[in-house]
Amino acid sequence: EDELQVIQPEKSVSVAAGESATLRCAMTSLIPVGPIMWFRGAGAGRELIYNQKEGHFPRVTTVSELTKRNNLDFSISISNITPADAGTYYCVKFRKGSPDDVEFKSGAGTELSVRAKPS
């Protein structure tokens, strides 16, 4: 069976301030089991944007219904974009682990740029 791939189809997305940004991400497999997370930036200082498992992320909504058992679409929409949201966003698949989940595979990243709000 082919190993899971994380596909972020857009290398970049440009959004006007105040609008919503949709960041697309798809998996090619449901295995290994484990959560999806979105981060802004890479490395130790990356910022958690969304965690499928837990947490409250009021500006983030998932595009697909993640409670579907066969769901492979982990795209998100971030509302009320501001210039501070600019950066590269990574969709990351974790595989289950005990006590901590283990990062399994990351998408290539999508760079979000923020345009000035039209006057």
Partner: antibody, heavy 118, light 107 residues
Framework: DVQLVESGGGVVRPGESLRLSCAAS????????MSWVRQAPGKGLEWLAG????????YYIDSVKGRFTISRDNSKNSLYLQVNSLTAEDTAVYYC???????????WGLGTLVTVSS | ALTQPASVSANPGETVKITCSGG??????YGWYQQKSPGSAPVTVI????KRPSDIPSRFSGSASGSAATLTITGVRVEDEAVYYC???????????FGAGTTLTVL
């Protein structure tokens, strides 16, 4: 507090049908997948069916496919199980359960007893 | 199918381990459910292999390794007497499966 309250059980004859209900409160019902699990007298727990939060996707154990139907009405915070062509083997306590993000269970109802007897 | 022992027994204060085998490690999440009497509502003691609900005492813990999961009760109490069911969710089949249950007797 999360509460799940089943109803609709009772004594029926073989071949008859029932609609079981589960009233949910204490959480945002429309955000959670739900399942039905049963326990026959003297037996263990048996998962029957699950449904996604929006209700568009349903999943069944092979032995009840085509005979049981899981559904939900998010406007009423209610989960349902339509059980048709009942047999004595369907005699059990039927529980509804809230699913975790990965389709296990965190909260359970008290159950409703279905007895199939001629 | 998930396999667990039919029964285990322990004295108060001892550590009890109940195993559940038969799932694939990379495709299955495990949970553990306590039922104190037949027909009574099950209580979730562990989900997602090792996650304990906030209202469950810390003496209950869970782990998973290889194709098996383990429920550990450290310092078992008389009130822990119950049947413990393991369950798995398999990401390949979208199906939940329960083990047959393990009766814990506290002597």
């Amino acid at each position: 507090d999360v509460q799940l309250v089943e109803s609709g059980g009772g004594v029926v004859r073989p071949g008859e049908s029932l609609r079981l209900s589960c009233a949910a409160s204490g959480f945002t019902f429309s955000s959670y997948a739900m399942s039905w699990v049963r326990q026959a007298p003297g037996k263990g727990l048996e998962w029957l069916a699950g449904i996604s939060a929006g209700g568009s996707d349903t999943y069944y154990i092979d032995s009840v496919k085509g005979r049981f139907t899981i559904s939900r009405d998010n406007s009423k915070n209610s989960l349902y199980l339509q059980v048709n062509s009942l047999t004595a083997e369907d005699t059990a306590v039927y529980y509804c359960a809230r699913e975790t993000w990965n389709h296990l269970f965190d909260y359970w109802g008290l159950g409703t007893l279905v007895t199939v007897s001629s | 199918a998930l396999t667990q022992p039919a029964s285990v027994s322990a004295n108060p204060g001892e550590t009890v381990k109940i195993t559940c085998s038969g799932g694939g490690y990379y495709s299955t999440y495990y949970g553990w459910y306590q039922q104190k009497s037949p027909g009574s509502a099950p209580v979730t003691v562990i989900h997602s292999d090792d996650k304990r609900p906030s209202d469950i005492p810390s003496r209950f813990s869970g782990s998973a390794s290889g194709s098996a999961a383990t429920l550990t009760i450290t310092g078992v109490r008389v009130e822990d007497e119950a049947v413990y069911y393991c369950a798995g969710y398999d990401g390949r089949t979208y199906i939940n499966t329960f083990g047959a249950g393990t009766t814990l007797t506290v002597l």
